[in-house]
């Protein structure tokens, strides 16, 4: 069945309560536009927004009986002549009569006669028609001609994008048959389709079509009042490919729209052929798109690649929701034209600081007020990380103008990254040289506290990302965050007393859910002792407040649980609702602080493994009294077990060679390579493809390289555990970008910079030490539990 | 074809106004923009300003802003600029061009030389 | 005085190739598109080259122009005596909100 057929078949379905054979239609109010009725909408009650009145009509090809509900009789069946009386359009019929056409359309053959509705003729330039009946015999005779093909064609087979040569010349009829049952002959839109008669079919349109003798390019270049767009065309190289074949839809803006837009941003543009030729494409569809098919908002791809949406407002036509059109349907040998007062401007001809919307203003007056807008060079390559208005409070609108640029300053980019090419570890580097970290999780992507909102673009020069906050690169570590703040005095204490204080200072992606003091009201000194006389229940529980991984609360898909793996081993559930962060359904009092090395969520109260049984009477006790939110298992005599610490402490212990490194004489500023054969290693990473985080798997060679500079330096690895003392010779050069360690059990992984600094320490020159020894270095963390 | 036909050399004296008149003809007026540059003796080309022939809205040169006015007669196709408070450097020959933004200053007038000598 | 800077003068011989340059800053050659004008002696100035490099119809092919950055430049080649003229180079000028000219260069067929 075709679109046509279907709607028509709802209007069936939807009129037969007032009996048989009833098509409901509906009616734009103060306009005399029907259509039938599809899905859509009927349960909307509007048509191009705008209220419809439901009419019952009698379905194409049945009439009404006299005393009987609904249309239980069938049209009489006459040749097309008789036909054009039957479907009411009797002045094409008159026009058939007196123009010699009838004994045509009386007599044998099969025709399919597009017949203007009576409605139609009155709305036609009254010159054209006064032409058309001085001169019968030859111009309303080719005029009616044209509207005619010389075969029956019902809408079924009316398909999209066919061309049909009528009985005038061979001249083309160019049929749409639209999604919505809209089916247009050059742009005139099919009202009562399908009457058959014995000689044919007859289909009612909505306007009498005129002869098509032009192209797309011939009209611009006719056209005085489109020589802008005519000379722009020519610019980028387009006017003569709108000579073409095609099914062009061209939003043609006028002169006076190119008067409207600012002259210094038509001059940019004009002086680039890459903006000035996606200018033009983004007027342009590769779709024939009539007017009378537009009754409601459609979304459509340009010949630039980017969208439009094409919608309706009564009789008027709007583009991307600004009515613009005002000349509608100027149908070509190739497409149709709509004249526009507004030239479209698609986000890859615009400078990134224009990409900016209506919510960030206030960062973009702020760029242009702090002189960085300068900054940003038309033929360089940026990113805006544009935090919306109302991120910006009145303390931060107020601040001195020099810390206001600083901040400023961390949210543009010196390169321009898209959507696509962000992941989860990515570091970004600011104009003002900071260092942004990239947290990429299942339903949000984050730059270090700032989870983005929709509506990323990509523009000539850059790209602009929209952030829910201002970005606030981190400056301490977890350690020295929670040492600078006194709520977290006993929490610390304890921390220390377990021997964990290096695991929060040195480098690494961690979440700690940091208990406040509140969180040991009422402990004892004596119970305190107590805790901390078991060093192994001490760093079980501290332990469980620290996950891998850096899951920022805003970053967690609302009301949903994620389940994540402590480093003591055991799950700890988060859900964030009503922008809080439940942290195993206890209300988070503060989160989203970002450190160096990881994030710290603040609760004020202790958390607790509800998997781990106590075995000490006075443990249980004192955990009873600090946690009430669980029930703690108690097991007599069941004991804490131990969390090898080597796990997180960094120790350089054993390297693996597998055959001797090479190594040569080098000249000043050449780079050495020195190759360490090792297993492959496996690397797994989160990137956004096309809006989607997609998890990577990366297989390395077997060949690890380390870049190496001219200027040699000695470092001295010392092995542990008892081994014999040997070192390596010349391992390292210069300053190492890239190393890479092969971990036993573990994944491969990048040094950050300071354990490289730790690395790059010793000059005392050692001997070789033999192959298939290895370096037991900090064993990586598992991903597991990144349920984000 | 296209043409651009100005009035007449005008000699003021330092303080008066000028207006001089640009008809043009062969075109669709109202399609197009009309920009006025003037040229002073032996000098180099400045930029004076814009109108929309079709909606009269206008874009001055900063350095004569609130001294210059252009307005357009769509009925007789005139574009016209109106200089006040003339000053002796502001001899020039003074030209109309059509201004079709996509591309500047496609045809010329023939200029008018306004003389200003007390 | 002109924003942006022209040599005052080029010369060569018929036939040869002359080329005309154009400096000027990020606010206007940097950023915006680049315009060229011939001026006869005693006549108006003449539309010869908009948009860095497209030639308006009419426009010999042996005018040609191009544009790197802050600078543009209008090379005219197989010189002829009709070409002695003026050269102007003009651009938008986003700090000042203006269209400016060069300060012009004569070119002299010898």
């Known amino acids: 069945n075709s679109y046509y057929d279907k709607v028509l078949a709802h209007s069936r379905i939807r009129g037969r309560d007032q009996g048989p054979n009833v098509c409901a239609l509906q009616q734009i109010l103060g306009t005399k536009k029907k259509y039938f009725s599809s899905c859509k909408n009927w349960y909307q009650g509007a048509i191009c927004g705008k209220k419809t009145t439901v009419l019952y009509e009698c379905c194409p090809g049945y009439m009404r009986m006299e005393g009987m509900k609904g249309c239980p009789a069938v049209m009489p069946i006459d040749h097309v002549y008789g036909t054009l009386g039957i479907v009411g359009a009797t002045t094409t019929q008159h026009y058939s009569d007196v123009s010699k056409l009838r004994e045509e359309i009386e007599g044998k053959g099969s025709y399919t006669y597009f017949a203007p509705s009576n409605e139609a003729w009155e709305n036609l330039d009254s010159d054209i028609r006064r032409g058309l009946e001085n001169n019968v015999n030859v111009e309303l005779l080719n005029a009616l001609h044209s509207h005619m093909v010389n075969k029956r064609m019902l809408t079924k087979d009316l398909k999209h994008g066919m061309v049909i040569p009528s009985m005038y010349n061979n001249l083309g009829l160019f049929i749409n048959h639209y999604p919505n049952g809209v089916v247009t002959v050059n742009c005139a839109r099919v009202i009562h389709g399908n009457q058959i008669a014995t000689n044919g079919v007859v289909h009612v349109i909505d306007r009498v079509l005129t002869q098509i003798g032009t192209s797309i390019q011939d009209f611009l270049e006719a056209e005085d009042d489109l020589s802008s767009f005519r000379a722009a065309a020519i610019t980028s190289d387009l006017l003569e490919s709108l000579g073409r074949d095609g099914h062009f839809t061209l939003f043609a803006p006028t002169n006076e729209a190119f008067e409207k837009l600012p002259r210094g941003v038509l001059e940019r543009i004009m002086g680039d052929k890459v903006a000035s030729e996606a200018l033009m494409k983004y007027h342009i569809l590769n779709t024939l798109q009539c007017s009378e098919a537009i009754t409601g908002g459609a979304v459509f791809e340009t010949m630039e690649g980017n969208t439009i949406e094409i919608g309706c407002e009564g009789d008027s036509i709007s583009i991307n929701g600004i009515k613009m059109v005002n000349k509608k349907d100027i149908v070509t040998k190739n497409g149709v034209i709509h004249l526009i007062d507004e030239v479209l401007i698609p986000d890859s001809a615009k400078q990134v600081i224009e990409l900016a919307g209506k919510q960030q203003t206030t960062f973009t007056d702020l760029v242009a007020q702090l002189g960085l807008a300068s900054s940003l060079k038309p033929d360089g390559e940026y990113t805006l990380l544009a935090p919306v208005n109302n991120a910006f409070s009145d303390d931060t609108l107020s601040m001195d103008q020099r810390l206001l640029k600083l901040i400023l300053q961390n949210h543009i980019l010196k390169v321009k990254v898209g959507l696509s090419d962000l992941y989860n570890g990515q570091i970004l580097e600011t104009i003002g040289g900071k260092q942004l970290r990239v947290f990429v999780y299942r339903t949000a992507i984050c730059i270090e506290n700032s989870c983005m909102v929709r509506g990323s673009k990509q523009g000539r020069n850059g790209a602009i990302h929209i952030f829910r906050e201002i970005i606030q690169p981190a400056e301490k570590s977890l350690h020295d965050k929670l040492r600078q703040d006194k709520r977290f005095s006993i929490f610390l204490s304890l921390l220390e007393a377990a021997d964990l204080k290096d695991l929060l200072t040195q480098p690494g992606d961690w979440t700690l859910f940091a208990p406040t003091n509140d969180a040991f009201k009422g402990m004892t000194s004596e119970e305190r002792e107590l805790l901390i006389g078991d060093k192994n229940a001490l760093q079980n529980i501290i332990l469980y407040h620290l996950t891998p991984g850096v899951y920022i609360g805003k970053g967690f898909e609302p009301g949903v649980t994620n389940i994540l793996k402590t480093t003591q081993g055991s799950k700890i559930y988060l859900k964030g609702v009503n922008e809080t962060l439940l942290v195993n359904e206890l209300k988070s009092k503060e989160s989203d602080i970002m450190t160096t090395n990881g994030v710290i969520h603040v609760v004020d109260k202790l958390l607790y493994p509800a998997d781990i049984p106590v075995g000490n009477d006075q443990l249980l006790e004192l955990l009873n009294k600090l946690i009430k939110y669980i029930q703690i298992k108690f097991v007599r005599g069941s004991t804490f077990k131990e969390i090898p610490m080597t796990v997180y402490r960094p120790a350089m212990t054993k390297i693996q060679i597998e055959g001797d490194p090479d190594f040569r004489l080098i000249k000043e500023g050449e780079t050495v390579t020195e190759v360490i054969h090792g297993e492959p290693v496996i690397k797994k990473y989160t990137k956004i493809i096309d809006g989607v985080p997609v998890e990577i798997t990366e297989k390395q060679t077997r060949e690890e390289r380390i870049i190496t500079g001219p200027e040699i330096k000695y470092t001295r690895i010392s092995t542990g555990g008892g081994e014999t003392g040997e070192t390596l010779q010349k391992f390292l050069q210069k300053e190492v970008s890239k190393v890479t360690k092969f971990i036993e059990g573990g994944d491969g992984h990048l040094f950050e910079d300071e354990e490289i600094k730790r690395l790059l320490q010793g000059d005392t020159p050692a001997k070789k030490i033999p192959a298939n020894k290895r370096v037991q270095g900090p064993r990586r963390r598992s991903r597991e539990g990144r349920s984000q | 074809q296209v043409q651009l036909v100005q009035s007449g050399a005008e000699v003021k004296k330092p303080g008066a106004s000028v207006k001089v008149s640009c008809k043009a003809s062969g075109y669709t007026f109202t399609s197009y923009g009309i920009s006025w540059v003037r040229q002073a003796p032996g000098q180099g080309l400045e930029w004076m300003g814009w109108i929309s022939a079709y909606q009269g809205n206008t874009n001055y040169a900063q350095k004569l802003q609130g001294r210059v006015t252009m307005t357009t007669d769509t009925s007789t196709s005139t574009a016209y600029m109106e200089l006040r408070s003339l000053r002796s450097d502001d001899t020039a020959v003074y030209y109309c061009?059509?201004?079709?933004?996509?591309?500047?200053?496609?045809?010329w007038g023939q200029g008018t030389l306004v003389t200003v000598s007390s | 005085q002109s924003v942006l800077t022209q040599s005052s003068s080029a010369s060569g011989t018929p036939g040869q190739t002359v080329t005309v340059s154009c400096s000027g800053s990020s606010s206007d050659i940097g950023s915006n598109r680049v315009n060229w004008y011939q001026q006869l002696p005693g006549t108006a100035p003449k539309l010869l080259i908009y948009?860095?490099?497209q030639r308006p119809s009419g426009v010999p092919d042996r005018f040609s122009g191009s544009k790197s950055g802050t600078s543009a430049s209008l090379a005219i080649s197989g010189l002829q005596s009709a070409d002695e003229a003026d050269y102007y180079c003009?651009?938008?000028?986003?700090?000042?909100?203006?269209?400016?000219f060069g300060s012009g260069t004569k070119v002299t067929v010898l």
């Open positions: 061009a059509r201004d079709m933004l996509v591309v500047p200053f496609d045809y």
């Open positions: 948009s860095n490099d």
């Open positions: 003009a651009a938008w000028d986003d700090s000042l909100s203006t269209y400016v």
